[in-house]
Amino acid sequence: SIPWNLERIIPAWHQTEEDRSPDGSSQVEVYLLDTSIQGAHREIEGRVTITDFNSVPEEDGTRFHRQASKCDSHGTHLAGVVSGRDAGVAKGTSLHSLRVLNCQGKGTVSGTLIGLEFIRKSQLIQPSGPLVVLLPLAGGYSRILNAACRHLARTGVVLVAAAGNFRDDACLYSPASAPEVITVGATNAQDQPVTLGTLGTNFGRCVDLFAPGKDIIGASSDCSTCFMSQSGTSQAAAHVAGIVARMLSREPTLTLAELRQRLIHFSTKDVINMAWFPEDQQVLTPNLVATLPPSTHETGGQLLCRTVWSAHSGPTRTATATARCAPEEELLSCSSFSRSGRRRGDWIEAIGGQQVCKALNAFGGEGVYAVARCCLVPRANCSIHNTPAARAGLETHVHCHQKDHVLTGCSFHWEVEDLSVRRQPALRSRRQPGQCVGHQAASVYASCCHAPGLECKIKEHGISGPSEQVTVACEAGWTLTGCNVLPGASLTLGAYSVDNLCVARVHDTARADRTSGEATVAAAICCRSRPSAKASWVQ
Amino acid sequence: QDEDGDYEELMLALPSQEDGLADEAAHVATATFRRCSKEAWRLPGTYIVVLMEETQRLQIEQTAHRLQTRAARRGYVIKVLHIFYDLFPGFLVKMSSDLLGLALKLPHVEYIEEDSFVFAQ
C-alpha cells in the first residue's frame, strides 16, 4: 500500500530497509535549489534547513499577488519527494534549501550560479559528508552554468538535474546538458515518457536515465499535513537525488562515476516505448528507468560500462564528432554511426591527457556520431595500438602485444573518401583471436587494457538475409565493451552499444541489393572482471 | 553533452577607435559573447563576465574595476552585482550592451554570457 512511484524505484527487498552510513548516522546532505519551501510541513520538519540564501528575479506583472503557499509549492513538493517522512525516497536525509526561483517559478542563470557558489563556500567553511545538489530547473543552454556544475562536481559534489519539460533535446538546456550532472527525464506509472499538456519530458543523449515524474504525491505547501500531486522532470530528478542520497548513506565513498554507472546498470531496461520520441532521437535516448541499486557489497566486482554519444558532427566534409568519458572512466572502445552511412570511421586519440572517441563524416554525408563505451575498470592501464592503412588489397592486423593486455575494442578509420573503393574492416575472432583486422585503406586502432582479472572475448552474429540491423548480446556476467559492424557487400550505418547489446545497422536501401552469401556481422567484445584471475583473452 | 548547444555566440572583437589607452588598444578581443538562443528568456543588461581559469582573486577585482573605470570614461555607469571567486573566476555586472565590445577586450576575459531565465520544471 505505497504509491506507484515509490514501488517502482524501490525494489521489494529495499522497502523496509533503512539506509544508514557505517557509523549509524545518515550524513548525506541534499541541497535543493528551487523556490522557498514550507519547512514546518510534517513531511520535512526537522529534516530541512532553510538557508538565508535568496537570489531571485522580481515577479512579472503589476497585479502579481504573492501568496506564501503558492510561492513554496514547487520546492516543498520536491523536498518531500527527496526526504519526506512518508512520501520520500530517502526518508531520513537532511536537506538544505536555497531560494533561486521566485513565486512564479522563475530564476536566473546568475542567481543559480551564486547559489552553486554558496554551496561551494559552505563546503569550504565546514566540510561535511557527501553532498547531493538537486537542480529541478532549466534554462537555455548556458556555457557558464554547465562550467559551474563541472567545477562543483570536481570537488566531489553529486549534481542531479531535471532534463526539462519542453519535449525537446535536453542538450539544448542547462544544467541538463552538463556532462557532469546526472540528468533525469520523466516517466509515468506505465513507464512511458511523461506528456505535460502539449509538451513533455525532454530526451536525447544528454539524459542519463528516466524516473517517475507523473502524478507524484508529495508534500503540499497548502497546509502542514497536506499532500498534492505534481508532475515534471523536477519530480523525476528528485527521485534520483533521493536514490543517490540512499546510495551515499550506505556507501559514502562512492564517486560520481560509480554512482552514475550503478544507476544505469541497475535501472529497469527497455520498458519505455521509444516511439514517443522523435525518430532521430530514439537511438540517442536511454531506455532506462531508475531503481535503487543494491550495495556494492552485494554486487561486488562487476565491470560497469555505459554508452556515451557525441553531439552530431554536422554535415561538412571534414566534420568530426567527439565523445568523452568522465575523468574516472576508461574509454574501452569507440565506434561511429551515420544515418546516411557516409562516414569515414572512428578512432581514439588523446586530447589534453584524456583519451577521446572521434568519428569523421564522409563527403556527401549528413553527419556522424561518435559512440564511446565508458567503463569503470579499477586499476586499469589502457593504451591504443594503431596501424596505418595497408596498401590496396592487403589486410591490416592489430593486436595487443603487451603482456597481460586484452583487447576491449576496435576502431577503423578510412583514408579514402570513396565508399565504393574500400572493403570495410573485419574483426575475426575465430581465425585471429584478440586481433582487430582492417581491410583496404583502413587505419586500425586496437584498445588494449590491463587490469586485475580482466578477461575478454569476441562474440559475433551474422545475418545474410535482408535486415536493418544485426545484434549480438553478451551473456550474463559479461559486459559489452566493444561493438563493431563487419559488413557484407552492403553499406553499413555503423554500430553502437545499447546496454549489453551490440547493434550493427545496415543501410535501408542496401537490403534489396544484398546477395545471400555476404553476411553483415555484429561483433561484440565482451569482458568481465574476476579480481582473482589474471588478465586473459578467452577464445 | 559538452558541446555548445543551440546557442548564440557572437564575436565582438572590434578594435576600439575611441580609446587611446595603450594597453587597451593593444589588446584585441579573442573573447566571445554568448546569449540564450531563446529571445524571450534573455535578460539584456545583466552579464556574467567569465575570466580565464587561472585568474587570481586580485585580478578578478582589478578586471571588474577596470571595466567600471573605462565605462565611466565613456559616460556609462555600471554596477558590479557579484564577484565569483570560488567556482570560477568572474563577475556579474549590470551595464549597457554598448559596453560589450569594451568588456571583451579586457585582459583575462574568456567570454561574456548574457544572463537569462531558468524555470521550475
Epitope: S1, I2, R42, R85, K91, I217, C223, C226 | -
Partner: antibody
Framework: EVQLQQSGPELVKPGASVKISCKAS????????MNWVKQSHGKSLEWIGD????????SYNQKFKGKATLTVDKSSSTAYMELRSLTSEDSAVYYC????????????????WGQGTTLTVSS | DIQMTQTTSSLSASLGDRVTISCSAS??????LNWYQQKPDGTVKLLIY???SLHSGVPSRFSGSGSGTDYSLTISNLEPEDIATYYC?????????FGSGTKLEIK
C-alpha cells in the same frame, strides 16, 4: 466495522512509565496514520503526535517531545504510546485516532477514535 | 502554535432549533478546519472536514462554513442525540490544535 480498541485504565506512581495500546480492526492498518490526543479532566483536546504505520515515521507536538514515544506493531495492527517520567500533570484521558494516510491526499482528519484510556498518576 | 478560540463555552437550545457554534483562529487557516463531536460518555466522532464537507454517516442537519480566521458549525434542526461538546480543529500548521469546546445542552 472499524474499531480502535484501547487498553484499560492505568493507575501509576509519579516517575514511572506507562505504555497504552490501541488495536485496530475493520480496516487496513497501514492506510491510516495513528494520532494520539490528550484530554485533561474538564479540558479541551491536545494533539500529542502521529505515526505512519507503513514506516514508523513520527511527528510530535513539541510540548510532548521527550514525554511520549509512538510505535506500531504491523503484525498485530496495534499502535502504542509510551509516556515516561509521569507526573500528576499527565493524568488525563488519552485517545488514539486514525487519520487518512498521505497518498489519499484529500484526507486530513481523524476518521475513527478509540474509546479513550484513563491514566491516573498518583502516589 | 495556532490558537483556536471557541468563545461560547456552553450553549442551551430547544429541540428543533437552529444552532450555530463559532470558532476563530489566531491566523488564517485557509479552510483547513474540522469539527468533532464528543458525547457525554467520551465517544468522539468526526462531523465536518475541510470547513464544509460532511463526513460519511453524519446527518445532513450538520453543516459547516467559514474562511480566513472565522468558522462555524450549524445544526439546522436540533435533535436529542446532538447533546454533546463540539470541538473545532485546525490542520493548517503543525501542531494540530483544537478549540476549547462548546457544550450544547437542551433547554
Amino acid at each position: 466495522e472499524v474499531q480502535l480498541q484501547q487498553s484499560g485504565p492505568e493507575l501509576v506512581k509519579p516517575g514511572a512509565s506507562v505504555k497504552i495500546s490501541c488495536k485496530a480492526s475493520g480496516y487496513t492498518f497501514t492506510d491510516y496514520y495513528m494520532n494520539w490526543v490528550k484530554q485533561s479532566h474538564g479540558k479541551s483536546l491536545e494533539w500529542i503526535g502521529d505515526i505512519n504505520p507503513n514506516n514508523g515515521g513520527t511527528s510530535y507536538n513539541q510540548k510532548f517531545k521527550g514525554k511520549a514515544t509512538l510505535t506500531v506493531d504491523k503484525s498485530s495492527s496495534t499502535a502504542y504510546m509510551e509516556l515516561r517520567s509521569l507526573t500528576s500533570e499527565d493524568s488525563a484521558v488519552y485517545y488514539c485516532a486514525g487519520g487518512g494516510i498521505y497518498y489519499r491526499y484529500d484526507r486530513n482528519y481523524f476518521d475513527y477514535w478509540g474509546q479513550g484510556t484513563t491514566l491516573t498518576v498518583s502516589s | 502554535d495556532i490558537q483556536m478560540t471557541q468563545t461560547t463555552s456552553s450553549l442551551s437550545a430547544s429541540l428543533g432549533d437552529r444552532v450555530t457554534i463559532s470558532c476563530s483562529a489566531s491566523q488564517g487557516i485557509s479552510n483547513y478546519l474540522n469539527w468533532y463531536q464528543q458525547k457525554p460518555d467520551g465517544t468522539v466522532k468526526l462531523l465536518i472536514y475541510y470547513t464544509s464537507s460532511l463526513h460519511s454517516g453524519v446527518p445532513s442537519r450538520f453543516s459547516g462554513s467559514g474562511s480566513g480566521t472565522d468558522y462555524s458549525l450549524t445544526i439546522s434542526n436540533l435533535e436529542p442525540e446532538d447533546i454533546a461538546t463540539y470541538y473545532c480543529q485546525q490542520y493548517s500548521k503543525l501542531p494540530f490544535t483544537f478549540g476549547s469546546g462548546t457544550k450544547l445542552e437542551i433547554k
